[in-house]
Every structure is written in C-alpha cells, then in structure tokens.
Interface confidence: medium
C-alpha cells in the first residue's frame, strides 16, 4: 500500500516567503475536518444539479492576526491564533 502522510493539524507555522531573521511571519497552515453525508431531500429540491452526497469542510484560518510590513514594501497578515472555520478561499 502507498504511504499515507497525515496532514498536520491546523497550527501557526512560519511563512519563509515573508519572514526575516528575527522577525518571523506566522500563518495558519494545516488541515481541518471534513465530513460527507447523504443530501437531505429538502436540500435536494433546491439544487439546480442534484447531488446525492453533501460534503462539509472547514479551513485552517486565522482567528486573530496583525498586519505587518515586510521587506518589499507591503503589508501581510501575521497570524496570532488559528482555528478551523469557514473557507474563504477556493481554488477555481
């Protein structure tokens, strides 16, 4: 069987792209739970394209953050706490 690498839990991790020596930029990274269940009939009725299975997921996002200036001349979010919550960003 192929190796399965567990996804690390949602925690603060250093973002090397923006970090400077002595001034780390921390951002929330990792995985959150997702679950799938049969789509309730009442929900099916409202769907344009009906799906038998509904999946529900949360994303690793910042619970709190500060905006800080990084070299290169712009602001980034320096996360101070993480939680699994609403997914704001979706890949198209």
């Amino acid at each position: 069987a192929p190796d399965v690498q567990d996804c690390p839990e949602c925690t603060l991790q250093e973002n090397p792209f923006f970090s400077q020596p002595g001034a780390p930029i921390l951002q929330c990274m990792g995985c959150c739970f997702s679950r799938a269940y049969p789509t309730p009939l009442r929900s099916k009725k409202t769907m344009l394209v009906q799906k038998n299975v509904t999946s529900e997921s949360t994303c690793c996002v910042a619970k709190s953050y500060n905006r800080v200036t990084v070299m290169g001349g712009f602001k980034v979010e320096n996360h101070t706490a993480c939680h699994c919550s609403t997914c704001y960003y979706h890949k198209s």
Partner: antibody
C-alpha cells in the same frame, strides 16, 4: 474585482495646486499601501511616495517632498495626491498604484498639463 | 537611494528570437534569500504591468516566455521567443528599501 479609478485630466495654470483622486474598489485600502508614480511625456517612471491609509503615515522620495502631499480617506476607500506650486515640470501622467507581489494593480492614470 | 541602471536603452529583436535586458543596482538588493527586483512592461497610453517579482517569480497570467534571473546587484529579464505583442518599454524596479526607484527603461521593438 480590484479597481483603482482615477479622476479625469486636469489643465492647470502655473503656480496653482491640483488634487488627484483614486477611488478604490474590490479591496480595503486600510489593508495595503497606496503609492503614487509620476511619468513625464516620453519619460520613465518616478516613485513619488506612499501612504499607509490605516494610520495616515506617508513616505516620499525626497525630490517630491514639499511638492506632493498624499492623503487617504478610508471611509470612501479613496487615495489622493495633491501637487502644489505647479510648473511645466509637473506636466505628466500620475498613476495610483497598489503594489503587492502577485497582486499588483494600477489606476489608469491622470494627465496633468 | 538605490539606483537602477538599465541597458540597453533600446533593442530591436527579430520575431521568435531572444530579448535580453539588464538592470544593475547601485548596491545589493538581495536579503534573506530574496532579491527585491521587479520587472514591468508598459505599452503607450497604458499603466505599467508587473511581469516578474522578486527577481524570478512570474506574475499570474504572464506568459512563460518571460523570465527573470539574478541576485545581488545584477539582474536580467529574458523574453524568448519574442512575439509581436511584446513590443513595449520594460522597466526594472527595486523594492529593497524606500524610496522605490525604477530603471530608465528599455524600449523593445520587434522586426
């Protein structure tokens, strides 16, 4: 989507002042810096300065100190560039610029003559 | 202030060939493993468009025929193969510290 809509062309008299406007949409100016860049006819790009709209802090290229004043109004999500004591040297296109790696946006430019 | 010296001032390249533009900073613009040089393309009557950031990173939506390289004080923008739509003026910019400065520009013509 992100847009920086600049005010229209200005025809000015020597010695006058002008205030250029950049109305921003699709993002909050508080979350970024707003830069202004000058381009004289058939010339290159010159960085004038920037503002941190979250607190009003400004930084200027020394050569524009006293000539340019950058302000911002977070309630209307608008950045401003005021130019004073206008001379022929100030004839140029002025661009508002949201400078961020991989999220770089410019206004369409305002011509001041 | 960090000054950027761009060369050549103008360049004529045949369709499908390689265009190479150089930018030399008056002092190092590299720090912590990154080089704070960006490349812009500008066509007449339009604002500049970011092509390359941090010396070698391609901005989203920019064709892969554009590439950037270099570190310290010496940087290069390559376009290969050159297409007709690449006729424009190209500027390097450093963002290592304030004030930000641009190179004088290189006008690229396609023959």
């Amino acid at each position: 989507q992100v847009q920086l809509q600049q005010s229209g062309a200005e025809l000015m008299k020597p010695g006058a002042s002008v205030k250029l406007t950049a109305s921003c949409s699709g993002f909050s100016i508080k979350d970024t810096y707003m830069h202004w860049v000058k381009q004289r006819p058939e010339q290159g790009l010159e960085w004038i300065g920037r503002i941190d709209p979250a607190n009003g802090n400004t930084k200027y290229d020394p050569k524009f100190q006293g000539k340019a004043t950058i302000t911002a109004d977070t309630s209307s999500n608008t950045a401003y560039l005021q130019l004073s004591s206008l001379t022929s040297e100030d004839t140029a296109v002025y661009y508002c610029h949201r400078f961020e790696f991989a999220m770089d946006y410019w206004g369409q430019g305002t011509t001041v003559t | 202030d960090i000054q950027g010296t761009q060369s050549p001032a103008s360049l004529v390249v045949s369709l499908g060939q390689r265009a190479t533009i150089s930018c030399r900073a008056s002092k190092s613009v590299s720090a912590s493993g990154y080089s704070y040089v960006n490349w812009y393309q500008q066509k007449p009557g339009q604002p500049p468009k970011l092509l390359i950031y941090l010396a070698s990173n391609l901005e989203s939506g920019v064709p892969a025929r554009f590439s950037g390289s270099g570190s310290g004080t010496d940087f290069t923008l390559n376009i290969h193969p050159v297409e007709e739509e690449d006729a424009a003026t190209y500027y390097c910019q450093h963002s290592r510290e304030l004030p930000l400065t641009f190179g004088a520009g290189t006008k690229l013509e396609i023959s």
